[in-house]
């Protein structure tokens, strides 16, 4: 099923299993179960770090309720400006009934543009990546991640939001796409298929991978997600393909082993902190980058997508667990939660490495059809 060019030294070749300390089994809700009455020094009195599944629904921001139980934890959070700018809070409280963007699903009515007009935009995601047409940009430097190694406490919320499984990340996970292009990680979630059916969102020369991880980030230039939506570079997503390998991936197992606890739509559990970077490929220097959108409503554009060239390997059993454990809306299995690829409409995908150079002996001269734009600006 893999394309001939998927070798160790070719685009998207070679997996990274990502190791982390094995951590003990966990209990149900703890750390940030409910809005906090008092936050740590330097933080406003805001609700605790909250969900933002998928690149999913933008919540309507509601005032903090006096009753902790009255708030619904959902979807793309709004990050409030904290008392100290260094530590944002992911504030995703909203009432489900009050948000039209909660009423969407994969493969059916209502059409997404009716849910959010931006879904009919010209520069949408995901896209098909054709390495031969990618513009090699030497200015694209290795990604820098800081603070992605988390101790087991505080625990993190893992939630089945009906569209994906999402891990809400605490403040302090910093990512740089390059000088002056700094972001804070908010959440990560996965997209997958079904038995024998791959479910990555992005494709490579038409090839769909078994699954895909997205780590969603907010630019440090913005205090809140709703301020950043639709603004160029306001949000950035790191994406990596997951494919089958011979061994169990211990980093992913820390999440996959907990999926049975959240099989039901809307359920959540708490998992020990882990090395978030171990969920990503080890090679931060080779990637594709383009400007697109959120892949779920509200489909806001201006999102910088960084798709790793290297894949992450999970065992066959792990991929099966991912695609066959969770339930979505209407007593249906949560499967095939990916959006169809969208037209580039003139966009050029950039590569941090010469992805267009074919390793076969036929290519005497590297074929690079697109030139690098102002990468790194």
């Amino acid at each position: 099923q893999r394309l001939p060019r998927m070798q160790e030294d070719s685009p998207l070749g070679g997996g990274s299993s990502g190791e982390d300390d094995p951590l003990g089994e966990e209990d149900l809700p703890s750390e940030e179960d409910s809005p906090r009455e008092e936050d740590p020094p330097g933080e406003e009195d805001l609700p605790g770090e909250e969900d933002l599944p998928g690149e999913e629904d933008l919540p309507e921001v509601k005032p903090k309720s006096e009753e902790e139980g009255s708030l619904k934890l959902e979807d793309l959070p709004t990050v409030e400006a904290p008392g100290d700018p260094q530590e944002p809070q992911n504030n995703a409280h909203r009432d489900k009934e009050g948000d039209d963007q909660s009423h969407w699903r994969y493969g059916g009515d209502p059409p997404w543009p009716r849910v959010s007009p931006a879904c009919a935009g010209r520069f949408q995601s995901p896209v098909d990546i054709r390495p031969q047409l990618a513009a090699f940009c030497p200015a694209l430097r290795p990604l820098e991640l800081l603070g992605f190694q988390l101790p087991p406490l505080p625990e993190l919320r893992l939630r089945n939001n009906g569209h994906s499984v999402q891990l809400t990340l605490p403040p302090g996970l910093e990512m740089a796409l390059g000088p002056g292009r700094e972001y804070r990680a908010l959440q990560l979630h996965l997209h997958w298929g079904a038995a024998g059916r791959p479910g990555s969102e992005h494709t490579v020369e038409g090839h769909r991978f078994p699954a895909e991880i997205h780590v969603v980030h907010l630019s440090t230039a913005f205090a809140r997600v709703d301020e950043a939506l639709g603004r160029p570079g306001g949000l950035a997503v790191l994406a990596a393909f997951l494919e089958e390998g011979p061994e169990e991936n211990s980093a992913y197992e820390q999440l996959l082993s907990r999926l049975e606890e959240i099989a039901e739509e809307g359920s959540e559990t708490q998992v020990p902190g882990l090395d978030i970077s171990a969920l990503l490929p080890s090679d931060f220097s080779r990637y594709f980058q383009y400007e697109g959108s959120l892949t779920t409503p509200p489909c806001a554009q201006g999102v910088i997508w960084t798709v790793f060239n290297q894949t992450v390997m999970l065992s066959a059993k792990q991929l099966h667990t991912l695609s066959d454990t969770l339930w979505g809306p209407g007593d249906s299995r949560l499967q095939l939660n990916f959006r169809a690829t969208q037209p580039l409409n003139g966009r050029v995908i950039e590569a941090s490495f010469p992805a267009g150079v074919d390793s076969s002996p036929r290519a005497a001269e590297p074929v690079q059809l697109n030139s690098c734009l102002a990468a790194g600006d």
Epitope: D20, D21, G24, E25, E26, D27, L28, P29, S30, E31, E32, D33, S34, P35, R36, E37, E38, P40, P41, G48, E49, E68, Q86, E87, L146, G147, F148, Q149, L150, P151, P152, L153, P154, E155, P170, P171, G172, Q270, P272, G273, D275, S277
Partner: antibody, heavy 118, light 111 residues
Framework: QVQLQESGGGLVQPGGSLRLSCAAS????????MSWVRQAPGKGLEWVSA????????YYADSVKGRFTISRDNSKNTLYLQMNSLRAEDTAVYYC???????????WGQGTLVTVSS | QSVLTQPPSVSGAPGQRVTISCTGS?????????VHWYQQLPGTAPKLLIY???NRPSGVPDRFSGSKSGTSASLAITGLQAEDEGDYYC???????????FGGGTKLTVL
């Protein structure tokens, strides 16, 4: 405002037991992991044990594993440390501390002194 | 012997700048875990001074700053004041020990 108040310290013989308590107020107790940190007289800080907000996960320093048990009662906003088989080297001021989302300890109690001596 | 190594003491005159180092290993600071700093004034409980390597809680003067590089971290104090005198501790998490670890502490003396 956040307040943590330890109690239960005192003089105990080697091999004896003691139960420390930490009463918390001013924040949603069940939403935070908590830890015990100790400081022997004239010495530095040593992390002893930690517990998740639900109480479902517990962690211990090697020096106390099998002898100390951390627990919490979220309905009473109280953290506990049950100390058994106490040794002279357990003599210290014991602080309870709240876990910050970054992995540090953002609020500390004033401490309670535990003296293990015959 | 502490997992994180700090100098036992540092000193400086009022108004001066001092730095306190904290050296770890590839299983703690070098692994990427956050470093935090605490101030313990004589006879009092420790107080969080810097969290997440570089961040100051509200109420902590900007004379205090933290940095981290490789397997070590540093706390810098500028414009030294008499009331800064006390013990300073660094702290991180160690994946080999599966434990939260502290430095041995540094006694700051304001001359």
């Amino acid at each position: 405002q956040v307040q943590l108040q330890e109690s239960g310290g005192g003089l105990v013989q080697p091999g004896g037991s003691l139960r420390l308590s930490c009463a918390a107020s001013g924040f949603t107790f069940s939403s935070y992991a908590m830890s015990w940190v100790r400081q022997a007289p004239g010495k530095g800080l040593e992390w002893v044990s930690a517990i998740s907000g639900s109480g479902g996960s517990t962690y211990y320093a090697d020096s106390v594993k099998g002898r100390f048990t951390i627990s919490r009662d979220n309905s009473k906003n109280t953290l506990y440390l049950q100390m058994n088989s106490l040794r002279a080297e357990d003599t210290a001021v014991y602080y309870c501390a709240r876990s910050h989302s970054s992995g540090g300890f953002d609020y500390w109690g004033q401490g309670t002194l535990v003296t293990v001596s015959s | 012997q502490s997992v994180l190594t700090q100098p036992p003491s540092v000193s400086g005159a009022p108004g001066q700048r001092v730095t306190i180092s904290c050296t770890g290993s590839s299983s703690n600071i070098g692994r990427g875990y956050n470093v935090h700093w605490y101030q313990q004034l004589p006879g009092t409980a420790p107080k969080l001074l810097i969290y997440g390597n570089t961040n100051r809680p509200s109420g902590v003067p900007d004379r205090f700053s933290g940095s981290k590089s490789g397997t070590s971290a540093s706390l810098a104090i500028t414009g030294l004041q008499a009331e800064d005198e006390g013990d300073y501790y660094c702290q991180s998490y160690d994946s080999s020990l599966s434990a939260w670890v502290f430095g041995g502490g540094t006694k700051l003396t304001v001359l």
